[in-house]
């Protein structure tokens, strides 16, 4: 098992990140999220399933989630739209976008990332770079400060063997290598960025963490531009 | 601040059964693990098992399958731990510990006719 | 499943003395935790992943270890130290505890 952040990774390097968003309930981190326009975060539709009841908000301009930095800022939440064809029980179109009460105030720690528009799947190989405040061993540890991790891009017929997911990825998700390096338990609707481009999302779906033969699984948001565009309009 | 509330002692009796309470404060249990932990009188510290609230999966050391259930309410932050079947070897201080980081104060479970 | 040996299981030093407490696995491990429990409180978190400082945990206590053999060191032991110490490891399921060390001041 994984000794690092992330699983297996390393902190990141304080506001080289400035997409970089956490999605908070009732004041405490839940999830990732990725800053794609100036009042909008793409997150994991699955991250507020049970938080009807909750205070949602977004964290932007953040390193470590604990301590004041000039550039940090905590923005209610004035729309959240979970992709209609998102259900608790699936892994599929779990996106999320949340509107912020008002446009995010950008500066270098807070810039919203550019999106990949071209439904073209990654190339395998391809090192990718995933960030997030999501748990760092299998203890459950959760990190103060922003973590990240380089894996590379898996190719969706070796994610798909029945050793792995079996058939579960289809051609709007896609995969990485997960061994001993992974996205895990809190990462999810994080940014999975692959040639500064944003190219998936970490999926919220239960998955086990480090384990080479269940890879992570993230939604291709090339896939989905239609919807995105749609809502941001 | 990161707070882990637990219920309150319990004698109970033989072959009875108890569920005892876990409630945080300062943090979402479905961004991490809950863990309980049983430390009998005058000894070791044994791990149970532990839950992710997230989705209920749960995975529990062998010895404590079918004694322990470990569950969890993200609505209310809360984990648990209920005790079947109850025998005087069960009588222990049980705690809760998210991420085995931070740890409930521990209830005291008292099994005697 | 993995069994953890700690030792010794009590021992004693005196105020300022270097302590080192070891916990060895019946196979090899990745990493380990290590705790200290004072009679009536819950045990509190000193080194995680093998290594990494607990938050608020003073900086005498340090932990090193690989494969099968791990260890706490205490670089001065001071009265507050007077504890028990047990390790876990976080590698195999079932996650087990060692047996823990008894540590008195002299």
């Known amino acids: 098992p994984p000794r690092g952040r992330i699983l297996g990774g390393r902190e990141a390097e304080a506001h080289a990140r400035p997409y970089m968003a956490s999605v908070q309930l009732n004041g405490a981190h839940l999830c990732g999220g990725v800053l794609v326009a100036e009042q909008w975060v793409l997150s994991a539709a699955h991250c507020l399933e049970d938080a009807a009841d909750g205070k949602v908000q977004v964290l932007l301009g953040a390193h470590s989630l604990s301590q004041p930095e000039p550039s940090k800022r905590l923005y209610d939440v004035l729309r959240a739209v979970p992709h209609p064809d998102s259900q608790p029980d699936t892994i599929d179109h779990d996106l999320l976008l949340l509107q912020l009460s008002e446009k995010a105030t950008l500066g270098p720690a807070v810039r919203p990332l550019p999106w990949q528009r071209v439904d073209r799947d990654v190339a395998p190989g391809t090192l990718c770079d995933v960030a997030g405040w999501g748990i760092v061993n299998h203890a459950g540890r959760r990190p103060d400060s922003l973590q990240h991790v380089l894996l590379p891009v898996l190719d969706r017929a070796t994610c798909n063997r029945r050793t792995h997911h079996d058939g579960a990825i289809t051609e709007r998700l896609m995969c990485a290598e997960s061994n001993r390096r992974d996205s895990c338990k809190g990462d999810s609707g994080g940014p999975l960025v692959c040639g500064g481009v944003l190219e998936g999302v970490v999926t919220s779906g239960s998955r086990v963490c480090g384990n080479r033969k269940k890879p992570g699984i993230y939604t291709r948001v090339a896939s989905y531009a239609a919807w995105i565009d749609s809502v941001l309009a | 601040e990161v707070q882990l509330q637990q219920s309150g002692a319990d004698l109970v009796k033989p072959g009875a059964s108890v569920k005892l309470s876990c409630t945080a404060s300062?943090?979402?249990?479905?961004?991490?693990?809950m863990h309980w932990v049983r430390q009998r009188p005058e000894k070791g510290l044994e791990w149970i098992g532990r839950?992710?609230?997230?989705?209920?999966?749960?995975i529990y050391d062998p010895q404590f399958q079918g004694k322990a259930t470990i569950t969890s309410d993200t609505s209310s932050n809360t984990a648990y731990l209920q005790l079947n079947s109850l025998t005087s070897e069960d009588t222990a201080v049980y705690y809760c510990?998210?991420?085995?980081?931070?740890w409930g104060q521990g209830t005291s479970v008292t099994v005697s006719s | 499943q993995i069994v953890l040996t700690q030792s010794p299981a009590i021992m004693s030093a005196s105020p300022g003395e270097k302590v080192t407490l070891t916990c060895s696995a019946t196979?090899?491990?990745?990493?380990m935790y290590w705790y200290q429990q004072k009679p009536g409180s819950s045990p509190r978190l000193l080194i995680y992943?093998?290594?990494n400082l607990a938050s608020g945990v003073p900086v005498r206590f340090s932990g090193s270890g690989s494969g099968t053999s791990y260890s706490l060191t205490i670089s001065r032991m001071e009265a507050e130290d007077d504890a028990t110490y047990y390790c876990?490891?976080?590698?195999?399921?079932?996650?087990?505890f060692g047996g823990g060390t008894k540590l008195e001041i002299k």
């Open positions: 876990q490891q976080w590698s195999n399921y079932p996650f087990t």
């Open positions: 839950i992710d609230p997230a989705n209920g999966h749960t």
């Open positions: 196979s090899s491990v990745s990493y």
């Open positions: 992943d093998t290594s």
């Open positions: 300062g943090f979402n249990i479905k961004a991490t693990y």
């Open positions: 510990a998210e991420a085995m980081d931070y």
